[in-house]
Structures are given as C-alpha cells and as structure tokens.
C-alpha cells in the first residue's frame, strides 16, 4: 500500500526552529519573521512498526529532498544523521528500522524515540545554533519535546 504522509514543521519546547546546517545536518535556533522560511519542512510518513498503544511509527523525510533522518551507530554511540535515499523507492510503508521513530504524543507535545535504539530521542540543546542530535536522556538539560505545525502540500 502507498504510504500516507503529511507535511509539517517541528519546533522544540523552547520554540527553536529546525534549519539545515550544511548538507547533512540540522540545527535548532530561534527564528522570527521572514527568517521562519528557513525552517525545514518534514514529510512525516506513517509507516509499519511494532504495535503499541501510545507510540505511532513514523519516518521523517525532508520535503522534496531525498533525505531522511536515520539512527545509526557511530563509534559505538547511537547517532542521528540525514541519510540520502533513492527517491524512486522512498517513502515506503516498510521503512528500514533506522529510519523509524516512535512518535509519542501527549497534550500536543511530541517526542520521537528511535525504533532502532529504544530510549534514545531526537533532541536539541538548550544552547542556540547547535546540531539536532540523538540523546539518551529524557527530562534532563537536553530538549526532547517538540510541537508540530501542519504545512500545506
């Protein structure tokens, strides 16, 4: 079956937006006014994953780019990266596990847990202009809560 997708932007709980930082990295910073146009638009695809009452498996691609957030081991540490894919084959219903995040939503606040590395979350730093990364702690200094804004297709 063809995969269902929605376009959206994400901001962390401090209202930092996500923008490209070089070809294969995202960073989080506060944007205002016309600068908001810099923020990346994600195509959130609803994919197959493990059954759970409160977790929805999604893949996060960059709209109209053949790039997906993925989770891999680098130097033995779970790491977030932007991975280039063949646009003829993606998105698809059965995404490889490294591309899958469990969307956990409570009161319109979203967390994105790596399906490949349970208890590791898409995270931002408190500091401005720092890379978006995969963090292994929740509720600490680093930010794991996001809000989502729909974007027209």
């Amino acid at each position: 079956a063809p995969v269902r997708s929605l376009n959206c932007t994400l901001r962390d709980s401090q209202q930092k937006s996500l923008v490209m930082s070089g070809p294969y990295e995202l960073k989080a910073l506060h944007l205002q006014g016309q600068d908001m146009e810099q923020q990346v638009v994600f195509s959130m695809s609803f994919v197959q994953g493990e059954e759970s009452n409160d977790k929805i498996p999604v893949a996060l691609g960059l709209k109209e780019k053949n790039l997906y957030l993925s989770c891999v081991l680098k130097d033995d540490k779970p790491t977030l990266q932007l991975e280039s894919v063949d646009p003829k084959n993606y998105p698809k219903k059965k995404m490889e596990k490294r591309f899958v995040f469990n969307k956990i939503e409570i009161n319109n606040k979203l967390e994105f847990e790596s399906a490949q590395f349970p208890n590791w979350y898409i995270s931002t730093s408190q500091a401005e202009n720092m890379p978006v990364f995969l963090g292994g702690t929740k509720g600490g200094q680093d930010i794991t809560d996001f809000t989502m804004q729909f974007v027209s297709s």
């Epitope: 079956a1 063809p2 929605l6 376009n7 929805i56 319109n108 729909f150 974007v151 297709s153």
Partner: antibody, heavy 120, light 107 residues
Framework: QVQLVQSGAEVKKPGASVKVSCKVS????????IEWVRQAPGKGLEWIGE????????NYNEKFKGKATITADTSTDTAYMELSSLRSEDTAVYYC?????????????WGQGTLVTVSS | DIQMTQSPSSLSASVGDRVTITCKAS??????LSWFQQKPGKAPKSLIY???RLVDGVPSRFSGSASGTDYTLTISSLQPEDFATYYC?????????FGQGTKLEIK
Amino acid sequence: QVQLVQSGAEVKKPGASVKVSCKVSGYTFSRYWIEWVRQAPGKGLEWIGEILPGNANINYNEKFKGKATITADTSTDTAYMELSSLRSEDTAVYYCSTIYYDYDQGFTYWGQGTLVTVSS
Amino acid sequence: DIQMTQSPSSLSASVGDRVTITCKASQDIDRYLSWFQQKPGKAPKSLIYRVKRLVDGVPSRFSGSASGTDYTLTISSLQPEDFATYYCLQYDEFPYTFGQGTKLEIK
C-alpha cells in the same frame, strides 16, 4: 465532550447542488481528519473522502471525484461537503466522522447524519 | 480497491450467546481495521479500532482479533442492546472500504 453536528435534511431536484455542513466542538479541529461517508436507503456505508483542516489536505474516493467537493473553515470549526449534479441515486444519508491526523484512532466520533433526497 | 468481504450477512442469536463476525481483506491492511455498530435510523457507533483496541465506553464483551488478513469481531455474551448491524472498515489505503454489513437479529 466531542460533538459533530450536521445540517438538516435537504430535498433537491435532479441537476441541483447541495452543501452539507458538519460543525465540530470538543477537540482541536485542525488536528483531526474529517471523513465523509454516505449510506443509501437500506444499503451499506461508502467512504467519500476526507480533509485535514490543519493544512487542507484532501483525499477523495475516485468514485466521487467531480461529484463531491470537501472544504473546511477553521475559523468556525466547520467542514463542508458539496454535492453537484444531483441524481436520484445520490439520495442517501451523509455522515461526517473524525480520525486523528496520524490515523491511529479510527472513525471515533460521528455526526447524526444528513438525509439528502433527490426527487423531481 | 481493497475488498472487505464480511460474513455472515445476517445472523440470528439469543441473549447470552457468543457470536463472531468476520471480515476478510483482499490484501494486507496493516491492522488499520475498525468495527462499527449501527441501529436503524442512527449513525454508526465506533466499537474497535486498530483490530483490537476498544473505544472508550464500549463494553468489554466486545473484542477484536486478526489472523493474517482475516479479522474477527466477537461478542462474548449477547445483550438485548447488541442486536444491530455491524460493519468493518479498512482505513489503510484509499479508498477506505467497508464490509457489506452483518445484521444481527434476535432468534
């Protein structure tokens, strides 16, 4: 609590159009798909299409493309479905329903239905 | 389009009986399967979504299960208010499609 309140019954002549409304309360309108379903007299349920008010994404059943036009007004939390070029076979009860934007929860809430009768 | 073949089309049973209604999908629907109850002149009422998750407020005598592309609604002990028509729905792929319905009547 969640409520979907639909407009009242309509009687229309063949060839006319009708616009059915579905006014929503009790949840964040922009985050739920509004689904439209029809049921002809004594028949089963048939899916027409859906709209996500948050970004105006619309998906139609091919069978109803050109027949149904689905819209939403986020200022009034109301969704609409307009049916054009009505024929007797469009006589049916039309329902709106909802599903969360991530498709997880099924068509949980339903409007009471709007009977559209097409008769000369 | 995905076909949802629902059986039986009608069923007579008594209060206290255990009844099962089946829907067979013509292809994989990734567990995007709901069950509805409808009484004459009323809107459908959602019972179950994602195969087996009970909608809030629905009695626990209703349950859902799956085996491959076969999906089953079970009512463990029929109550007088359960006599109605039941529909399944796949919402995995456009167009979403309903089963033809099963009319559950008092024996």
